[in-house]
Interface confidence: low
Amino acid sequence: ACDTATCVTHRLAGLLSRSGGVVKNNFVPTNVGSKAF
């Protein structure tokens, strides 16, 4: 199984923002960013 930050981020897509912003549930994002314009 792929457990890199990229894979985890994409697996959670739809549950919370890829960026970790605009959180829709209690998952903690594993990637580095915040949605940046």
Partner: antibody, heavy 122, light 107 residues
């Protein structure tokens, strides 16, 4: 070369409509979350609307000031983003920028267009 | 809506000096803050995202810090090309919001 090129701006009367376009090239457009951000003359930045990537069902969100009047959409086959603006008001006068954003986990990509000016005046 | 307040409104410094710009959020935004530079007639340019991550190609003299409600952008030694307007933004929730900007001008 990565490019976002906005078009469709111009002078329109209050109550009128305008459709802005943003043509993307040099990156995988369908993977990107795209926002419109505007800037009134001499003022600061204001987020207008966002459309998420194809894999995120192209979900949309809007600022309260434009909700019900503006519609954001995308055509991934044409690498294009649109902003349909109806019932325009004087306070919608601004330079409109499109912005592409992709987070691939370890870092992000962030691109801006050069902007297109919308003037709402009688 | 989360309000971001930037200070000072204008900062007058000389090349080589250190610049410290502040951004305060009306509610907690964890680390979901970005910083942008904008020069007249140009689109904004992303400098910092996730409060402290430098964007691709951004010089090391730019750094960001903070979490919760208080955030700082620091330019360690000002170059002539750094004089511009700087904005912070938050992406913790909708609507995404920006601060009103800090104008960094040559003293």
């Amino acid at each position: 070369e990565v490019q976002l090129v906005e078009s469709g701006g111009g002078l329109v009367q209050p109550g009128g409509s305008l459709r802005l376009s943003c043509a993307a090239s040099g990156f995988t457009f369908s993977n990107y979350w795209i926002s419109w951000v505007r800037q009134a003359p001499g003022k600061g930045l204001e987020w207008v609307a966002e459309i998420r990537s194809e894999s995120d069902a192209s979900a949309t969100h809007y600022a309260e000031a434009v909700k019900g009047r503006f519609t954001i959409s995308r055509d991934n086959a044409k690498n294009s983003l649109y902003l349909q603006m109806n019932s325009l008001r004087a306070e919608d006068t601004a330079v409109y920028y499109c912005n592409g954003y992709f987070d691939y986990g370890l870092a992000i990509q962030n691109y801006w267009g050069q902007g297109t000016l919308v003037t709402v005046s009688s | 809506e989360i309000v971001l307040t930037q200070s000072p409104a204008t900062l007058s410094l000389s090349p080589g000096e250190r610049a410290t710009l502040s951004c305060k959020a009306s509610k907690r935004v964890t680390t979901y803050v970005s910083w942008y530079q904008q020069k007249p007639g140009q689109a904004p340019r992303l400098l910092i995202y996730g409060a402290s991550n430098r964007y691709l190609g951004i010089p090391a003299r730019f750094s960001g810090s903070g979490s919760g409600t208080d955030f700082t952008l620091t330019i360690s030694s000002l170059e002539p090309e750094d004089f511009a307007v700087y904005y912070c933004s938050q992406s913790y929730n909708y609507p995404y919001t920006f601060g009103q900007g800090t104008k960094l001008e040559i003293k």
